[in-house]
């Protein structure tokens, strides 16, 4: 849990108890099981992919 009295993390970031700081949700691309990824918004939309030639 984030310590009481501390500012919430900014948009696009989430609190990491493992690191004791806010972490950019983009870092979940490197390590999706990091603890702060649970607090990140739903995964960003997948890149558009053509389903036909």
């Amino acid at each position: 849990e984030q310590a009481p009295g501390t500012a919430p993390c900014s948009r696009g970031s989430s609190w990491s108890a493992d690191l004791d700081k806010c972490m950019d949700c983009a870092s979940c691309r490197a390590r999706p099981h990091s603890d702060f990824c649970l607090g990140c918004a739903a995964a960003p939309p997948a890149p558009f992919r053509l389903l036909w030639p």
């Epitope: 493992d18 004791d20 691309r29 490197a30 999706p32 990091s34 997948a46």
Partner: antibody
Framework: QVQLVQSGAEVKKPGASVKVSCKAS????????IAWVKQAPGQGLEWIGE????????YYSEKFRGKATLTADTSTSTAYMELSSLRSEDTAVYFC?????????????WGQGTLVTVSS | DIVMTQSPLSLPVTPGEPASISCRSS???????????LYWYLQKPGQSPQLLIY???NRASGVPDRFSGSGSGTDFTLKISRVEAEDVGVYYC?????????FGQGTKVEIK
């Protein structure tokens, strides 16, 4: 440049304990995970656990829970792994490795390995 | 736990010829973000493992372009387009999808 330098080889008797060190340099020690990996003679790689040095929070493989204890000293940028109640099957090379948690994936860095021999 | 299975376990190669190693995971390594959390390492004799490929197909810094990774989901391949003498060692696949971090059994590549 990033470097992980491990302590030297150890020979221990069954039932004893051993503490292996991993000194980090070239980066902010508290910003990355240090993992520990076992390689028994002629065998593959086996994850033991990992530590977040800044907070001391640890994650262990079920197999090594109670066998290994991971700690870190931020004042010296050194991670430690203590193995207790040593048995012959604990004879192995033990590696520490820096693992990334950031978007710009910059690879894993490994220590040179520490050979621990358990023999009566 | 995710089980990683490699084949073959031994691979005799001829310098200048291509080589290929297969890795299969017991569950899909394709995350909802469309990234495959599959990694390839090479452990040269007497050395520590070194990262070759991350996230399925991305070469790590300093890795020669003769190494390439492909595949998705549960089936992955490491290819060496033209084997060189310095490529001998044991190749491991591993995942980074969750804990525990697990590795394949290793594929020993040696010169014929």
């Amino acid at each position: 440049q990033v470097q992980l330098v491990q302590s030297g080889a150890e020979v221990k008797k069954p039932g004893a304990s051993v503490k292996v060190s991993c000194k980090a340099s070239g980066y902010t020690f508290t910003d990355f995970i240090i993992a520990w990996v076992k390689q028994a003679p002629g065998q593959g790689l086996e994850w033991i656990g990992e530590i977040y040095p800044g907070t001391g929070r640890t994650y262990y493989s079920e197999k090594f829970r109670g066998k290994a204890t991971l700690t870190a000293d931020t004042s010296t940028s050194t991670a430690y792994m203590e193995l207790s109640s040593l048995r012959s099957e604990d004879t192995a090379v033990y590696f520490c490795a820096r693992r990334t948690i950031y978007y710009d994936y910059d690879g894993d860095y490994w220590g040179q390995g520490t050979l621990v021999t358990v023999s009566s | 736990d995710i089980v990683m299975t490699q084949s073959p376990l031994s691979l005799p190669v001829t310098p200048g010829e291509p080589a290929s190693i297969s890795c299969r995971s017991s569950q899909s390594l394709l995350h909802s973000n469309w990234i495959n959390y599959l990694y390839w390492y090479l452990q040269k004799p007497g050395q520590s493992p070194q990262l070759l490929i991350y996230q399925g197909s991305n070469r790590a810094s300093g890795v020669p372009d003769r190494f390439s990774g492909s595949g998705s989901g549960t089936d992955f391949t490491l290819k060496i387009s033209r084997v060189e003498a310095e490529d001998v060692g044991v190749y491991y696949c591993a995942h980074n999808l969750e804990l525990p971090w697990t590795f394949g059994q290793g594929t020993k590549v040696e010169i014929k």
